[in-house]
């Protein structure tokens, strides 16, 4: 805390420029009005002010609004984004997007502080919904946040939305996002034609049913041994030998290599060896032939 | 790595004269504006005198007329010409990137002036 001390003579801030550089912190809370830095606050970000200067200017503002800043402080505040803490974001009220990516702009290049998460949060709880545009920003900015979402986050995301996704977007999402990702993706690609629509859909394909897969087996979509990696253990499981090598067409014989990885291990202890042969890649652990194989929990649900 | 290393510093006599040098590496020193600070023992973090990638000098009240700072962009030096040295110029003089924003951190070149 800056001790309070009348400003010398003739230092007196007229306006915020840069010989304010200069003042020392007791001279900046002394000299520099609270109501000329909000109406000046475009010129902070332009001025070299160090760190502990920047301190000095948030102090005044906190004392100016200690119920949060207005937005037009908020959208110019550069630089001194970085000294705000998550419970000083709280009490604002965000509503531009021209502002989110402002101050996002001042966080670029490092990783999504506790700060930004607030920001983000306000923003998109004072939207009622992560719209098409707000999904775009945030996304480039940050490739990861649609992941970092919970599922129950998630449900608020439109289809329309969807369209904003890229795939990278949704690397580091588990299953149970990709569950609720994968029927908005469903629902905003279905006028697409078979190949456009498996080009858009296919990194979101770790949430689809098998009834979807197996739809796709008869659609000639040559899926890669990564996308099928990711899918849905219980998706995969029960599809034919002759669906799955429909679903990778060419790909099929990335099989052998991840024989040992589910769900390519789970799929094939649940296969006939007879047709495993049938691929002629040497995949084993198949059902011995003469084999009977009874599904108890399909019994269980019918008793 | 954004290097800067500053000499020169040490002992004088009121009324003497002293040559700080900074030289930097690590960034493209002729794009950048440099600055000077000081500490003094007790004493808060003070900027100095400023130059910017055009040439263009600025001074804080106290030094004005008796510091001169300067660069030699070949040697990717900037330099604070101390004349007519006080007392109270008694501090740890560091050179920094404006655009780092930091000010008083770091080894820096302590000054001491008796009277």
């Known amino acids: 805390e800056v001790e309070k001390t009348a400003c010398p003579s003739g230092k007196k801030a007229r306006e915020i420029d840069e010989s304010l550089i200069f003042y020392k912190k007791w001279e900046l809370e002394a000299c520099v009005d609270a109501a000329l830095l909000a109406t000046q606050m475009d010129r902070v970000n332009a001025i070299p002010f160090t760190y502990e200067q920047l301190d000095v200017l948030k102090h005044k503002l906190d004392e100016l609004y200690p119920q949060g800043y207005p937005e037009s402080v908020i959208q110019h505040l550069g630089y001194l984004f970085l000294k705000m803490s998550p419970e000083d974001i709280r009490k604002w009220n965000v509503t531009s997007l021209e502002t989110l990516k402002a101050l996002l702009e001042v966080n670029k290049g490092h990783e999504m502080s506790p700060q930004v998460a607030t920001l983000i949060d306000r923003f998109v709880k004072g939207r009622g919904q992560l719209d098409k545009d707000t999904l775009d920003t945030l996304t480039a900015f940050y490739p990861g946040y649609l992941c970092s979402l919970s599922p129950e986050e998630l449900s608020s995301v439109p289809p329309s939305s969807i369209w904003a996704v890229r795939p990278q977007d949704l690397d580091t999402c588990d299953p149970r996002q990709l569950d609720v990702l994968y029927p908005k993706a469903r629902l905003a690609f279905q006028n697409m034609n078979g190949s456009e629509y498996f080009v858009k859909i296919q990194s979101f394909l770790g949430g689809a049913p098998t009834e979807d897969l197996k739809a796709l087996s008869q659609q000639n979509v040559s899926m890669d041994l990564a996308t099928f990696m990711k899918l849905r253990t219980d998706a995969v499981l029960p599809l034919t030998v002759a669906e799955v090598q429909k679903l990778l067409g060419p790909h099929v014989e990335g099989l052998k290599a991840e024989e040992r990885h589910r769900p390519v291990r789970d799929w094939i202890l649940r296969q006939r060896q007879d047709d495993l042969d049938t691929l002629g890649l040497g995949l084993q652990g198949g059902i011995p032939n003469g084999y009977l194989v009874l599904d108890l929990s399909m019994q269980e649900a019918l008793s | 790595e954004v290097q800067l290393v500053e000499s020169g510093g040490g002992s004088a006599q009121a009324g003497e004269t002293l040559r700080l040098s900074c030289t930097a590496s690590g960034f493209t020193f002729d794009d950048s504006d440099m600055g000077w600070y000081r500490q003094a023992p007790g004493d808060e973090c003070e900027l100095v005198s400023t130059?910017?990638?055009?040439?263009?000098?600025n001074y804080a009240d106290s030094v004005k007329g008796r510091f001169t700072i300067s660069q030699d962009n070949a040697k990717n030096t900037v330099y604070l010409q101390m004349t007519s040295l006080k007392p109270e110029d008694t501090a740890i003089y560091s050179c920094r990137t404006m655009a780092s924003r930091i000010g008083c951190w770091g080894q820096g070149t302590l000054v001491t002036v008796s009277s």
């Open positions: 130059i910017s990638s055009d040439g263009s000098t």
